[in-house]
């Protein structure tokens, strides 16, 4: 790994909680001020694998809501506009990390949590069992 | 928005850090016990838009390890295996929050960030612009 | 009024042969998915084999794959299940039943049939 | 193909709520859909795309579907809802997969 020095300007931390627990700024930075949010939004209707935007709302997590993606076929959208099921529509899936309250309802005590999102869904050729 | 009682068990909190800066544990908790990692891992193969994963590394980010999908065409797979420039393979885009040290090279001192990964691609119908 | 009505089923000892048929209609047949789904006596219902429109693609459980083969003839609105080398675990009524889908997404079973009684046994 | 687990049975008093839940791997990042059959009878759509409802099924039978687990509600039970209930979804084969039933009954 990388080793960086420390900086001497840091927040003084016990021993005994560190690096276990560490201070957070929820001043949220943006790092996307180039990108256009809505630039993908409309890809959800368009694919040939399209899918469905679904709102989990959860007070105990930050952020507290996440949207999930369904495929809305089991195959994919063909040139004619019908569903072809020698394709089939997949979840593209992404492990995030989220603050989850800990203890319960407390407005400043978090631990990290990883959970697991469909973002959106993609086109795949079927894997085919082949019976002897 | 939903109102939840106060847990009387929360660590206290100075007026004027709260809530910009909260305590966070740092032992993940996996909520994605029950499933496998490696279920969506061929996708990227087998995809009509398939995607190449690249490795973006930065020690002062938590996680510090994030992968990008990059589309590998600019079109998409058709059944005879050849780009189809008909179609558009299209990256599917999502905003996540990392930790960003804060000050930079201290161990237990972060701030939220949000930045922009694409996941995966996907294959749409392009946008055709008419001319009159 | 969609209508599905099974048929073909009856008694038939292990090793033997039956091929199951559904008949449609009060919906244009050819375009959707068709299924077979199966339940034991006193048992839950269990998916067996599913034919896409055109009948190009066919999917089959592991408990019947290389036994049953699953066709349709669009131009009679009729779907088959050909059940070969059955064996006493065969044993259930057999029920038709549609896959329908419409731009929204894909609505699973909406109509079934009254279902055929296969049992499998010396 | 992952398999779907429900309670074998749920008792419920008249104009009570009975929940029946159904759960397995990412269950939430799939559709599920719910089938009612009663006794010699075929099944019976009742709740598909997770907690949409077809044309002709009471207001009463909801649905909801996120992490691992599906849960069909039926709100102000009656004794006509006494029946199996079968979950539904699809695994990456394209294969339908039920889960084992739960009967429902009115006491």
């Known amino acids: 790994g990388i080793t960086i020095p420390r900086n001497p300007g840091c927040p003084n931390s016990e021993d005994k909680n560190f690096p276990r627990t560490v201070m957070v700024n929820l001043n949220i930075h943006n790092r996307n001020t180039n990108t256009n949010p809505k630039r993908s939004s409309d890809y959800y209707n368009r694919s040939t694998s399209p899918w469905n935007l679904h709102r989990n709302e959860d007070p105990e997590r930050y952020p507290s809501v996440i949207w999930e993606a369904k495929c809305r076929h089991l195959g994919c959208i063909n040139a004619d506009g019908n569903v072809d099921y020698h394709m089939n529509s997949v979840p593209i899936q992404q492990e995030i990390l989220v603050l989850r309250r800990e203890p319960p309802h407390c407005p400043n005590s978090f631990r990290l949590e990883k959970i697991l999102v469909s973002v959106g869904c993609t086109c795949v050729t079927p894997i085919v069992h082949h019976v002897a | 928005g939903i109102t939840i009682p106060r847990n009387p068990g929360c660590p206290n909190s100075e007026d004027k850090n709260f809530p910009r800066t909260v305590m966070v544990n740092l032992n993940i908790h996996n909520r994605n016990t029950n499933t496998n990692p490696k279920r969506s891992s061929d996708y990227y193969n087998r995809s009509t838009s398939p995607w190449n994963l690249h490795r973006n590394e930065d020690p002062e980010r938590y996680p510090s390890v994030i992968w990008e999908a990059k589309c590998r065409h600019l079109g998409c797979i058709n059944a005879d295996g050849n780009v189809d420039y008909h179609m558009n393979s299209v990256p599917i885009q999502q905003e996540i929050l990392v930790l960003r040290r804060e000050p930079p090279h201290c161990p237990n001192s972060f701030r939220l960030e949000k930045i922009l990964v694409s996941v995966g691609c996907t294959c749409v119908t392009p946008i055709v612009h008419h001319v009159a | 009024e969609v209508q599905l009505l099974e048929s073909g089923g009856g008694l038939v000892q292990p090793g033997g042969s039956l091929r199951l048929s559904c008949a449609a209609s009060g919906f244009t047949f050819s375009p959707y998915m068709m299924v077979w789904v199966r339940q034991a006596p006193g048992k839950g219902l269990e998916w067996v084999s599913g034919?896409?429109?055109?009948?190009?693609?066919?999917y089959y459980a592991d408990s019947v794959k290389g036994r049953f083969t699953i066709s349709r003839d669009n131009s009679k609105n009729t779907l088959y299940l050909q059940m070969n080398s059955l064996r006493a675990e065969d044993t259930a009524v057999y029920y038709c039943?549609?896959?329908?889908?419409?731009?929204?997404?894909?609505?699973?079973?909406?109509?079934w049939g009254q279902g055929t009684l296969v049992t499998v046994s010396s | 193909s992952g398999g779907l687990t429900q309670p074998p049975s749920v008792s419920v008093s008249p104009g009570q709520t009975a929940s029946v839940t159904c759960s397995g791997d990412?269950?939430?990042?799939?559709?599920a859909s719910w089938y009612q059959q009663k006794p010699g009878q075929s099944p019976v759509l009742v709740i598909f795309?997770?907690?949409k409802r077809p044309s002709g099924i009471p207001e009463r039978f909801s649905g909801s579907n996120s992490g691992n687990t599906a849960t069909l509600t039926i709100s102000g039970t009656q004794a006509v809802d006494e029946a199996d209930y079968y979950c539904?979804?699809?695994?990456?084969?394209?294969?339908?997969?039920f889960g084992g039933g739960t009967k429902v009954t009115v006491l």
């Open positions: 039943t549609r896959h329908y889908y419409d731009s929204s997404g894909y609505l699973s079973f909406d109509y």
């Open positions: 034919i896409y429109s055109s009948g190009g693609a066919t």
């Open positions: 539904q979804t699809w695994d990456s084969s394209t294969r339908a997969v």
């Open positions: 795309q997770d907690s």
């Open positions: 990412a269950l939430g990042q799939k559709y």
